[in-house]
């Protein structure tokens, strides 16, 4: 077996030397030599580096712009970026969550299958037979038609996916 010609996992090759990378949260100030160590410095306030690296500059933390409906979900550290999410009633337009849009409402005839979160929109579903929704809502599920029988009433008007059944009294003339 040949000896390693590459550096070890947390090292990089520079000037024929295998130097230690800087650990997360630190940036490279100077490369190692045969007799000096890699010099690293911690990232400043509002900066981060999330990997073992040889970067000479740290990355700026993401800014959660309230004008775009964003707020801080998790504050960044020297090793992690800030995580943004959307204000109540809004959700991210992308995985990176760079802006927000208002949660969609489910139209009459449709109910909420899954309520929206900060990162996903409302999921609507058509109300199946026996269920209805008569409002436009981001929260309401399809409601079951009223059971006239349990109230000792009869159906006077059939329900639809947008309207409930209308119940009425039993026909007294009927035997």
């Amino acid at each position: 077996p040949e000896p390693p010609t590459a550096c070890r996992e947390k090292q990089y090759l520079i000037n024929s030397q295998c130097c230690s990378l800087c650990q997360p949260g630190q940036k490279l100030v100077s490369d190692c030599t045969e007799f000096t160590e890699t010099e690293c410095l911690p990232c400043g306030e509002s900066e981060f580096l999330d990997t073992w690296n040889r970067e000479t500059h740290c990355h700026q933390h993401k800014y959660c712009d309230p004008n775009l409906g964003l707020r801080v979900q998790q504050k960044g550290t020297s090793e992690t970026d800030t995580i943004c999410t959307c204000e109540e009633g809004w959700h991210c337009t992308s995985e990176a969550c760079e802006s927000c849009v208002l949660h969609r409402s489910c139209s009459p005839g449709f109910g909420v299958k899954q309520i929206a979160t900060g990162v996903s929109d409302t999921i609507c579903e058509p109300c199946p037979v026996g269920f209805f929704s008569n409002v436009s809502s981001a929260f309401e599920k399809c409601h079951p038609w009223t059971s006239c029988e349990t109230k000792d009433l009869v159906v006077q008007q059939a329900g639809t996916n947008k309207t409930d059944v209308v119940c009425g009294p039993q026909d007294r003339l009927r035997a």
């Epitope: 390693p4 996992e9 947390k10 230690s20 650990q23 045969e34």
Partner: antibody, heavy 121, light 107 residues
Framework: QVQLVQSGAEVKKPGASVKVSCKAS????????MHWVRQAPGQGLEWMGW????????NFAQQFQGRVTMTRDTSISTAYMEVSRLRSDDTAVFYC??????????????WGQGTLVTVSS | DIQMTQSPSSLSASVGDILTITCRAS??????LNWYQQKPGKAPNLLIS???RLRSGVPSRFSGSGSGTDFTLTISSLQPVDFTTFYC?????????FGQGTKVEIK
């Protein structure tokens, strides 16, 4: 200002275990493999194995497999080497040494001061 | 495993002498060979890496040569501090192995 500082001398009975520590300072501990070398009294140097401080992975010389354990605690930049089921012929000075790789060679550039382990009944 | 055979295992010499220590590998190790000096009660200290690269701070009276299986450490003019033990080491493949050492004594 790289330093490898080892724990103090130990006297152990046959069958016991001993754990030697090696505290690193002056460099990024997880960036360099740490090796252990044994030297019996009046004898030569014997390579025992290495530990990757980042992952904890190890590689041992065959005669040390099974009885020697190498571990590390990255939070305190310390490597450990434990020998179990000690015998009187395990009496030796144990050294930790840092590995340096260049494109022309691989060598130990820094050594601990050594830890004498005496096994005696 | 690669065997490293150092010779002689001990020798007597005088201050000012030229000294040659040899190290033979049981198989080709290219130039993955290091020389260390060890003073009594101390850890070894690297003198030469890659068969011939003198470590900075090591006196120029030390030199190394060789490749493949045969290597030499030469001390051009022995000084009183040189009466210690010298080891060769191969790092071509694990297990890394050392020569048995050469002890240099004052004649």
């Amino acid at each position: 200002q790289v330093q490898l500082v080892q724990s103090g001398a130990e006297v152990k009975k046959p069958g016991a275990s001993v754990k030697v520590s090696c505290k690193a300072s002056g460099y990024t501990f997880a960036g360099y493999y740490m090796h252990w070398v044994r030297q019996a009294p009046g004898q030569g140097l014997e390579w025992m194995g290495w530990i990757n401080p980042d992952s904890g992975g190890t590689n041992f010389a065959q005669q040390f497999q099974g009885r020697v354990t190498m571990t590390r605690d990255t939070s305190i930049s310390t490597a450990y080497m434990e020998v179990s089921r000690l015998r009187s012929d395990d009496t030796a000075v144990f050294y930790c040494a840092r590995e340096k790789i260049t494109m022309t060679g691989i060598y130990f550039d820094y050594w601990g001061q050594g830890t004498l382990v005496t096994v005696s009944s | 495993d690669i065997q490293m055979t150092q010779s002689p295992s001990s020798l007597s010499a005088s201050v000012g002498d030229i000294l040659t220590i040899t190290c033979r590998a049981s198989q080709n190790i290219t130039t993955y060979l290091n020389w260390y000096q060890q003073k009594p009660g101390k850890a070894p200290n690297l003198l030469i890496s890659a068969a011939s690269r003198l470590r900075s701070g090591v006196p120029s009276r030390f030199s190394g040569s060789g490749s493949g299986t045969d290597f030499t450490l030469t001390i051009s003019s022995l000084q009183p501090v040189d009466f210690t033990t010298f080891y060769c080491q191969q790092t071509f493949t694990t297990p890394w192995t050392f020569g048995q050492g050469t002890k240099v004594e004052i004649k």
